[in-house]
């Protein structure tokens, strides 16, 4: 059962923690047994991987989302689940793997050339009235998130950040602009090398929150310039 899995003391031997005060990696004694993760219609086995309990999508990795592991299961227990690949069923964007988004309950590619016509059509449909948003676009958050938002809330159409509620900014999403959450500490951010590069993004991120700046993740200094990962960090 899920509870017995969560209570397992076994943990995979992973690289050292990412810094800060996380200076105490647990002594790995054995690998956890293969665990079943929902992956579309069939369950996929991910060997030697211990479930990671979560409360929000932001706690999970980039290739995961936070949800109850069983359909209609214990609503109080959520873990990070492997993201859904293209053509798999979804309820929100966070469920789909990077490079995909949730459209009509299915993960589809966000490749701008292939899907441009379809996406523009979607935006016209979705923003045709004040009560709908882009195919249930929402922050990477739990399944209880509302699919519809009032003006100024997450997912609402905007022209500038002042149109959005506190804690949100106005950022491009496909070929429209909607209110998105200002980034938290530790979240991946976009560092623009030259002026005007904002215009190239179809999934524009908000800026980092107060007291934070977008800087290279310490562990990624050795990476090549093109692949350096930037995150919101304290000044």
């Amino acid at each position: 059962t899920l509870n017995s899995v969560l209570n397992s003391n076994a943990i995979k031997n992973l690289p050292p923690p990412l810094g800060g005060a996380a200076g105490h990696p647990g002594s790995a004694v054995s690998a956890a047994p293969g665990i079943l993760y929902p992956g579309g219609n069939k369950y996929q086995t991910i060997d030697n991987y211990q479930p990671y309990p979560c409360a929000e999508d932001e706690e999970c990795g980039t290739d995961e989302y936070c949800a109850s592991p069983t359909r209609g299961g214990d609503a109080g227990v959520q873990i990070c689940l492997a993201c859904r690949k293209r053509r798999k069923r979804c309820m929100r964007h966070a469920m789909c793997c990077p490079g995909n988004y949730c459209k009509n309950g299915i993960c589809v590619s966000s490749d701008q050339n292939h899907f441009r016509g379809e996406i523009e059509e979607t935006i016209t449909e979705s923003f045709g009235n004040d009560h709908s948003t882009l195919d249930g676009y929402s922050r990477r958050t739990t399944l209880s998130s509302k699919m519809y938002h009032t003006k100024g809330q997450e997912g609402s159409v905007c022209l500038r950040s002042s149109d959005c509620a506190s804690g949100l900014c106005c950022a491009r999403h496909f070929w429209s602009k909607i209110c998105k959450p200002v980034l938290k500490e530790g979240q991946v951010c976009t560092k623009h090398r030259r002026k005007g590069s904002h215009g190239l993004e179809i999934f524009q991120r908000c800026y980092c929150g107060e007291g934070l700046s977008c800087r290279i993740q310490k562990d990624h200094h050795q990476a090549s310039n093109s692949s350096r990962l930037h995150t919101c960090q304290r000044h």
Epitope: I11, L14, L18, A22, A55, E56, E58, E64, R140, G186
Partner: nanobody, 124 residues
Framework: EVQLVESGGGLVQPGGSLRLSCVAS????????LKWVRQAPGKGLEWVSH????????MYAASVKGRFTISRDNAKNTLYLQMNSLKPEDTAVYYC?????????????????RGQGTQVTVSS
């Protein structure tokens, strides 16, 4: 720099109670879900409990459900764990932890930010 400092551990008899505290700094406390994990001697990390950023939802491992209560005070940047009806098998070092955020492809307890931990020993 993310810092988490736990306190409140100690030696207690079976059936006794303890209240652990964790003071956090270096990040916006009220914006992050937090958790307690523990590590028994010679064992790996075990998730104990979880609380959402605003404290409206909690989760517990089956082994502690009904005995432990997690809570937080966002005004004081403090996380708590009230432990009642303690058992010898609860003996462990208890860590307050926060996710590292979306900087890894797969999250793991090993990659969390944690404090130094506080020792809880349940013995008669």
């Amino acid at each position: 720099e993310v810092q988490l400092v736990e306190s409140g551990g100690g030696l207690v008899q079976p059936g006794g109670s303890l209240r652990l505290s964790c003071v956090a700094s270096g990040f916006t406390f009220s914006m992050w879900p937090l958790k307690w994990v523990r590590q028994a001697p010679g064992k790996g990390l075990e998730w104990v409990s979880h609380i959402t950023s605003n404290g409206d939802r909690t989760m517990y491992a089956a082994s502690v459900k009904g005995r432990f209560t997690i809570s937080r005070d966002n005004a004081k940047n403090t996380l708590y764990l009230q432990m009642n009806s303690l058992k010898p098998e609860d003996t462990a070092v208890y860590y307050c932890a926060r996710s590292a955020g979306q900087v890894v492809s797969r999250a793991s307890l090993e990659n969390d930010y944690r404090g130094q931990g506080t020792q809880v020993t349940v013995s008669s």
